[in-house]
């Protein structure tokens, strides 16, 4: 059992400065009651449970959700419940999604502005470049793993019988018929939103109209705004705006502090929402199972495809990513993962990386010792562009469809699938089921039939959850890696690269206890602008 953190004379955990000038618990990664340390006495067991109560509640919620869903399904499912009871059954989960989505906009914008403004341009560029490199490499690895697994396990050949039950006509109308070029142009357009206010709830998308031009019917691309937050545009704007504020120097300091304070307030809300998460997750998972028709038949006919996706996600998430993390940091990656179990379970429940972002930020900062300016800069970018899970699933799905329709995949096609999956996963941008839309682009790129996308959609409710878990895990490990990179470069250089915006007014350095809604955590403020010190962690590392 690892000893409790050393206490100072006032009973506070001894803290040391972090990279951004704040305070952090001494060697957070080395505290381990729950993460592999053993809980001996009754007192230690109690502390162990208290420290990990939220994690345990979340895991129990997922398991209970599956059990409840299967139970209700067995008792007649959605039909037996009836529309009114079903909507009441769905409500607690819907509420969690609404709470999380409510918080996304202020969190992403404020954290990125604050994060970008708190880094000098050189450090910002380096951090961003390393992050993007990590995201690119891991997404490519995920794609390669997906293709390899699908070629080895041959899920398409095994599921060929589903062709017969679906019928010859498949369901091509479900598949979005969009030009590959237009998809990437839309991505570029969304990076530069024409209206920041509408970007908060709308994205740009190209659709097509058939027009009669001199007796010939021609398909004309028509641009329109569609429902759904343009998170990509907001992320880019926030980063650029943060850099601009930084350039202003003292004039921009007030605004930077405003965004940082806004961010802190948002994180207080997040800590409150976290305690509702287990309830929401339970009902999100249960209601999804209840809504599904003929789950057993789907598993029989598409079992090998589902297995391929889940196995791929498990290998990438439990072996590949942790191995990369270990190779670069020489730290136990599973301890890191234990610290983010709550957001991972939330990712499984909500099926949205954006919705999981608030909880992920809170957990990597408080449980895994990632500095705020790193987590709040890297995680929103990761949630937008890092889609390991989606890329892996798309590759499995493309190979699955090729096998299902007996279409060959030569080396060139496999490379095309890898590259297109990696590139198009960027465009999925944290939207639930975005992966299925980008799958159509991949199929078009290698001339595979889109008819069978309806089959992929049939099990997307499960595979997409697994995708999201992997996506957010990749984001978090990326933040952890970058924290390690910053720690190493800072220990080598005397002049710190990452600066904290200093307060103009000297504030009382005495610790003032503040409750942040988490009944198990007492937070103490250090000097203004410094990181929060927690006397007990949700997940003691």
């Amino acid at each position: 059992m690892v000893a409790d953190p050393p206490r100072d004379s006032k009973g506070l955990a001894a803290a040391e400065p972090t990279a951004n000038g704040g305070l952090a618990l001494a060697s957070i990664e080395d505290q381990g009651a729950a993460a592999g340390g053993y809980c001996g006495s009754r007192d230690q067991v109690r502390r162990c449970l208290r420290a990990n109560l939220l994690v345990l509640l979340t895991v129990v919620a997922v398991v209970a959700g599956v059990a409840l869903g299967l139970g209700v399904s067995g008792a007649g499912g959605a039909l037996a419940l009836g529309p009114e009871r079903l909507s009441a059954f769905v409500f607690p989960g819907e509420l969690l999604l609404r709470l999380l989505r409510m918080i996304i906009l202020p969190l992403v914008v404020c954290s990125l502005i604050g994060g970008a403004a708190s880094l000098d341009p050189g450090a910002l560029g380096r951090l961003g470049a390393w992050a993007l490199l990590f995201f690119l490499v891991t997404t490519l690895l995920a794609s390669a793993l997906g293709v390899g697994l699908a070629l080895a396990l041959q899920p398409g050949a095994a599921s060929a019988a589903i062709n017969a039950s679906v019928g010859a006509a498949g369901s091509a109308e479900n598949a979005p018929s969009k030009e590959v070029l237009d998809s990437f142009l839309d991505l570029a357009r969304n990076i530069f939103p024409s209206n920041l206010v509408s970007a908060a709830f709308r994205s740009y998308s190209t659709t097509y109209e058939e027009r009669n031009i001199t007796g010939t019917r021609v398909k004309v691309p028509v641009g329109q705004e569609v429902e759904g937050m343009n998170i990509l545009g907001l992320v880019v704007f926030a980063i650029v705006f943060g850099v601009a504020l930084r350039k202003l120097g003292p004039e921009g300091e007030l605004l930077i502090r405003f965004f940082n304070s806004f961010n802190e307030a948002t994180m207080v809300l997040v800590s409150w929402i976290m305690w509702y998460a287990p309830v929401g997750i339970l009902f999100l998972v249960a209601s999804k199972i209840v809504e599904m028709k003929d789950v057993r038949q789907l598993f029989i006919s598409l079992g090998k495809y589902i297995l391929c996706c889940l196995l791929g996600h498990a290998i990438h998430g439990l072996l590949v990513l942790p191995l990369i993390y270990f190779l670069f940091t020489r730290k136990n990656p599973y301890r890191f993962l234990w610290g983010i179990v709550t957001p991972l379970a939330t990712a499984f429940g909500t099926s949205s990386s954006s919705a999981t972002l608030p909880l992920m930020m809170k957990c990597v900062e408080e449980n895994n010792g990632v500095a705020k300016h790193i987590s709040r800069f890297i995680l929103p970018i990761g949630a937008t562009v890092n889609m390991d899970g989606a890329a892996l699933f798309q590759c499995v799905a493309a190979v699955f469809i090729a096998q299902l329709s007996q279409q060959s995949l030569d080396f060139v096609k496999i490379i095309t699938i890898l590259v297109t999956a990696t590139a198009s996963s960027v465009g999925a941008a944290g939207i639930p089921a975005g992966g299925v839309l980008t799958l159509a682009i991949i199929l078009e790129a290698v001339n595979l039939p889109v008819d069978h996308i309806s089959l992929i959609l049939a099990v997307d409710w499960l595979v997409d959850r697994s995708c999201t878990v992997l996506n957010v895990e990749g984001d978090a490990l990326g933040a952890g890696l970058l924290q390690n990179y910053v720690d190493r470069t800072e220990s080598r250089s005397t002049e710190p690269e990452l600066i904290q915006v200093k307060s103009e007014l000297p504030l009382d350095p005495l610790p003032v206890p503040t409750e942040e809604g988490n009944p198990l955590l007492k937070h103490y403020r250090g000097p203004a602008g410094d990181a929060t010190v927690a006397s007990e962690k949700e997940s003691v590392m």
């Epitope: 062709n163 498949g170 398909k219 001339n447």
Partner: antibody, heavy 120, light 107 residues
Framework: QIQLVQSGPELKKPGETVKISCKAS????????MSWVKQVPGKGLKWMGW????????IYGDDFKGRFAFSLETSASTAYLQINNVKNEDTATYFC?????????????WGQGTTLTVSS | DIQMTQTTSSLSASLGDRVTISCRAS??????LNWYQRKPHGTVKLLIY???RLHSGVPSRFSGSGSGTDYSLTISNLEQEDIATYFC?????????FGGGTKLEIK
């Protein structure tokens, strides 16, 4: 070279069963799907469905579910079309066609056709 | 299902002529358009796939073009052996559907 050789013409009475064969040569049989296409005299071509030659799973077009059955004898590189309880409207020429393994749905090699005449 | 329409059911031309046969789809088929030739009481042969790609062994006088919903097959220098019925077929979505055919005759 690649060849698809079909069995000879058939004359059947309504209610009988007919089985048409299609022997493939010159390529790996299980790599390419095998489709069946119907041509009624004086009319166009109509796709009946195809069989996944690797998995042995038949997929039928909407108008050909029920009395029609596709099957394989992989060791002999042969595909079969069986029509049960034949009717007068089944009078047509039936083609087996190798489904290309690229560019979605097209048929790069065809059998010579088997004429089925249903007459009482 | 996608409907394929060959407006000209029969066409007369002289040897050496340039002949164009057209085909229209009821919706955008994204270039998944193929052309077949059926000689009288003979077998069916693939000529062109994916709008314009020539199948192996097909003479270069055959060419294809088009996009969206409108496609055409061109025989640049008509020969006696080209007398046949020509079918277009969409391969975009299941079920694959064929045009009614255009019968090519000598004037």
């Amino acid at each position: 070279q690649i060849q698809l050789v079909q069995s000879g013409p058939e004359l059947k009475k309504p209610g009988e069963t007919v089985k048409i064969s299609c022997k493939a040569s010159g390529y790996t049989f299980t790599t390419f799907g095998m489709s069946w296409v119907k041509q009624v005299p004086g009319k166009g071509l109509k796709w009946m469905g195809w069989i996944h030659t690797y998995a042995g799973v038949p997929i039928y077009g909407d108008d050909f579910k029920g009395r029609f059955a596709f099957s394989l004898e992989t060791s002999a590189s042969t595909a079969y079309l069986q029509i049960n309880n034949v009717k007068n409207e089944d009078t047509a020429t039936y083609f087996c066609a190798r489904r290309s393994d690229n560019y979605r749905y097209f048929f790069d090699y065809w059998g010579q056709g088997t004429t089925l005449t249903v007459s009482s | 299902d996608i409907q394929m329409t060959q407006t000209t059911s029969s066409l007369s031309a002289s040897l050496g002529d340039r002949v164009t046969i057209s085909c229209r789809a009821s919706q955008d088929i994204r270039n998944y358009l193929n052309w077949y030739q059926r000689k009288p009481h003979g077998t069916v042969k693939l000529l062109i796939y994916y709008t314009s790609r020539l199948h192996s062994g097909v003479p270069s006088r055959f060419s294809g073009s088009g996009s969206g919903t409108d496609y055409s097959l061109t025989i640049s220098n008509l020969e006696q052996e080209d007398i046949a019925t020509y079918f277009c077929q969409q391969g975009h979505t299941l079920p694959p559907t064929f045009g009614g055919g255009t019968k090519l005759e000598i004037k």
